[in-house]
């Protein structure tokens, strides 16, 4: 005979669960489906990841997202995790928003990002609900910098980047400062491949770095080079 009262709690059907913290009166729920739509848009050494919530929330409101990163070396095809070498705009686990920016990506590397959706009962199943997106980083190569000439008060510096990338660059930014003086620096912008830094102190070492500026933002910066002006005993202009 049927019981005169309803049961105080019901067993969940297969594939449905109650989380340990769920009250017995709460309906049975299940893990969410994968994020519905994921895009990865590369901008220089950054990637913006955007996704839409799962179509099936599993009947729960407590959805969070985790982002993981894998990098692959194009020459060898070998891959490995890259959490240690990239920077996320916010901690990549337990995200409640549906976007994140990943920066400090390396030029000419292939990246695969995985976004996983989880809710309060995801830990009760072994399967995962995730979507992946891949992106290749095509940031400009760091400029190769040379000292072309120097005098007691000037340094003539030139640089190059591979010809196929030159059309993407609208200007170059040259940053320089006296060695040992980290409080002040000078910046010069130019469209060409060389610059003469004037009004420098004699017999002094300067730190010089060149960075390409592209439509997507900054290209990779060159090495920080140390160039030294001539001492007053040195003769006039000297080509190196």
């Amino acid at each position: 005979l049927p019981s005169p009262e309803g049961a105080t709690s019901c067993e969940c059907e297969e594939g449905f669960f109650r989380a340990p913290q769920d009250p017995a009166s709460m309906p049975c729920t299940r893990p969410p489906s994968a994020p519905h739509y994921l895009t990865a848009v590369g901008m220089g050494a950054k990637v913006e990841l955007r996704w839409t919530p799962p179509q099936d929330s599993g009947g729960r409101e407590d959805i969070v997202y985790s982002v993981t990163c894998e990098q692959c070396w194009p020459e060898s095809g070998e891959c490995g995790p890259c959490e240690a070498s990239v920077r996320y705009s916010e901690p990549p686990h337990g995200l409640t928003r549906t976007s994140v920016t990943v920066s400090d990506l390396e030029p000419h590397m292939n990246y695969t990002f995985t976004v996983e959706a989880r809710n309060g009962v995801s830990g009760l199943v072994t399967s995962r609900s995730f979507r992946t997106a891949s992106v290749s980083i095509n940031q400009t190569e760091p400029p190769k910098v040379r000292l072309e000439g120097r005098s007691t008060t000037s340094l003539s510096v030139s640089w190059s980047i591979p010809p196929p990338q030159q059309s993407r660059v609208w200007k170059y930014e040259v940053t320089y400062r006296k060695k040992g003086d980290s409080n002040s620096y000078n910046v010069r912008r130019t469209e060409g491949f060389s610059v003469t830094l004037d009004d420098l102190a004699p017999d002094t070492t300067y730190l010089v770095q060149v960075q390409a500026l592209t439509q997507e933002g900054q290209g990779a910066g060159s090495k920080v080079h140390e160039f030294q002006t001539l001492s007053p005993e040195g003769s006039g202009n000297l080509a190196v």
Epitope: L155, K179, K223, E226, Q228, L230, V240
Partner: antibody
Framework: QVQLQQWGAGLLKPSETLSLTCAVY????????WSWIRQPPGKGLEWIGE???????NYNPSLKSRVTISVDTSKNQFSLKLSSVSAADTAVYYC?????????????????????WGQGTMATVSS | SYVLTQPPSVSVAPGQTARITCGGN??????VHWYQQKPGQAPVLVVY???DRPSGIPEQFSGSNSGNTATLTISRVEAGDEADYYC???????????FGGGTKLTVL
């Protein structure tokens, strides 16, 4: 081919001064910045400081108050003194030569790679 | 002060490729040098200026550096490559030389 030969007292008591010397054979002290580096047992490398032939020095900030590096160009030698030693200063101490001259035609190489190292001197501080 | 971060240990089977990383803020703008050190011996320079090899160092040692990570790659690893490996840079902001903490490479 340049060779580095180093020597100095191996056993010290706390608060004493560690003194080591490094002789450069087969080359001149000029044009290079010469370094001292140490390695405590089972640990990593730590740069102590550097000196050039004219006596200009640059020290690791964590040791600066206790370190003196000097040069004797007539003997082609440079030396390290570390005062007020404690057990934490127990280490193998190395002298080292950078790969390239410090500056050539206006292009300088601070913190260059070290291609030649002394044989190392174990200094133990114990009461 | 500038900090270089290396994994304490890396294990690899003979014949495989080992990758040892050296992390530091904007390390790509610095020249990175790598040393191999075997027990009881002074360090030996294996790669300088990110990717160049001194004479006498075999081709199996190579390096790369960009962004925040420099990498020493040892291809076709053999038992004789088992050692500690250190990265080194010059920090131009403080004018001081910095070593990474070292990575012990174990050949399985």
């Amino acid at each position: 081919q340049v060779q580095l030969q180093q020597w100095g007292a191996g056993l010290l008591k706390p608060s004493e001064t560690l003194s080591l010397t490094c002789a450069v054979y087969g080359g001149s002290l000029s044009d290079y910045h010469w370094s001292w580096i140490r390695q405590p047992p089972g640990k990593g490398l730590e740069w102590i400081g550097e000196i050039n032939h004219s006596g200009s020095t640059n020290y690791n900030p964590s040791l600066k108050s206790r370190v003196t590096i000097s040069v004797d160009t007539s003997k082609n030698q440079f030396s390290l003194k570390l005062s007020s030693v404690s057990a934490a200063d127990t280490a193998v101490y190395y002298c080292a030569k950078p790969f390239r001259p410090h500056c050539t035609n206006g292009v300088c190489h601070s913190g260059d790679a070290f291609d030649i190292w002394g044989q190392g001197t174990m200094a133990t501080v114990s009461s | 002060s500038y900090v270089l971060t290396q994994p304490p240990s890396v294990s690899v089977a003979p014949g495989q490729t080992a990758r040892i990383t050296c992390g530091g803020n904007n390390i790509g703008s610095k020249n990175v040098h790598w040393y191999q050190q075997k027990p009881g011996q002074a360090p030996v320079l294996v790669v300088y200026d990110d990717s160049d090899r001194p004479s006498g160092i075999p081709e199996q040692f190579s390096g790369s550096n960009s962004g925040n990570t420099a990498t020493l790659t040892i291809s076709r690893v053999e038992a004789g490559d088992e050692a500690d490996y250190y990265c080194q840079v010059w920090d131009s902001s403080s004018d001081h030389l910095v070593f990474g903490g070292g990575t012990k490479l174990t050949v399985l």
